[in-house]
Amino acid sequence: QEEDLPRPSISAEPGTVIPLGSHVTFVCRGPVGVQTFRLERESRSTYNDTEDVSQASPSESEARFRIDSVSEGNAGPYRCIYYKPPKWSEQSDYLELLVKETSGGPDSPDTEPGSSAGPTQRPSDNSHNEHAPASQGLKAEHLYHHHHHH
């Protein structure tokens, strides 16, 4: 009998509010034995896979997805899913990435919510919504403004 797979978690380092041009790393975590982690982004059809999975603890594995220079187009919700043979997990909650202008004028707030806000708690996707909708990926040529289509 196949085991029930725990939902992955997603976090961002150094946080979820990133200055334009700075780097951010999404960290996806799941149980040991994960073969592939996939990072998806809402409202985008692209995604990123990695099989570069490391053991974060005796009971947990993780993968890291880095964006070297964040642009406005990288803003929006991200989520993880993983493959542990012979099946895929459910998706994680979405984590919202905010991108702020570095040239803070007088109207710009000095601080914004950080990674302590954690994943945005949206209702779990229905089983037929696993692409609802998926990521844009992390390549520089894939830069679009984020729009909700729901």
Partner: antibody
Framework: QSVKESGGRLVTPGTPLTLTCTAS????????IQWVRQAPGKGLEYIGA?????YTYYASWAKGRVTISRTSTTVDLKMTSPTTEDTATYFC?????????????WGPGTLVTISS | ELVLTQTPASVSAAVGGTVTIKCQAS??????FAWYQQKPGQSPKLLIY???KLASGVPPRFKGSGSGTEFTLTISDLECADAATYYC?????????????FGGGTEVVVK
């Protein structure tokens, strides 16, 4: 890397028929596979898809008429009670690496003829 | 259910000319969109996806643009080999399933 359809043949109306899409040279578990058909002289018609995570989707006209299922190396399309209108070439296709929106890998197609 | 309206149904242009094909979606599909080329007796070939990225091996004479509900395929510097039928497709799997609908196709005749 390739996909190839098989199972197409001449059958009489109402005879169940299963088409198989076989993946070669890549790990099927990472990919969505769609089934598309083309009647003689007509355009492309979407039938449905099996997603990487194992879920299935169907065009509204296909619901109840076909069933899509997958194994680790194949994706099957079962036509439960075909009619003469189902005569067509059936294609399977795999989405492109890194993007669900485009299907870059297509099989040559398999011809299904439904006739009494 | 999602409908993709593709226009024109047929277009003719001279070698070296330019052809523009449009595809309109009845609902917003974001970037879940692709263009295909099909020649008689052959399988479809992916040209553009995402909806402005060029598929591998496709010359830059083919250009895709648009997002949401309006999409365009432009073929410039037409060659005889471009004579084919072109299809748009939505491949959106979302909260409201919109699916893998195809447009009706556009026959391109090169003179």
């Amino acid at each position: 890397q390739s996909v190839k359809e098989s199972g197409g043949r001449l059958v009489t109306p109402g005879t169940p028929l299963t088409l198989t899409c076989t993946a070669s040279g890549f790990s099927l578990y990472k990919y969505n596979i769609q089934w598309v058909r083309q009647a003689p002289g007509k355009g492309l018609e979407y039938i449905g898809a099996s997603t990487y995570a194992g879920y299935t989707y169907y065009a509204s006209w296909a619901k109840g008429r076909v069933t899509i299922s997958r194994t680790s190396t194949t994706v099957d399309l079962k036509m439960t009670s075909p009619t003469t209108e189902d005569t067509a070439t059936y294609f399977c296709a795999r989405h492109i690496d890194g993007d669900y929106s485009g299907y870059a890998l297509w099989g040559p197609g398999t011809l299904v003829t439904i006739s009494s | 259910e999602l409908v993709l309206t593709q226009t024109p149904a047929s277009v003719s242009a001279a070698v070296g000319g330019t052809v523009t094909i449009k595809c309109q979606a009845s609902q917003s599909i974001g970037t879940w969109f692709a263009w295909y080329q099909q020649k008689p007796g052959q399988s479809p070939k992916l040209l553009i996806y995402g909806p402005s990225k060029l598929a591998s091996g496709v010359p830059p004479r083919f250009k895709g643009s648009g997002s949401g509900t309006e999409f365009t395929l432009t073929i410039s510097d037409l060659e005889c080999a471009d004579a084919a039928t072109y299809y748009c497709q939505s491949t959106y799997f979302g909260v409201d399933y919109l699916g893998g609908t195809f447009g009706g196709g556009t026959e391109v005749v090169v003179k």
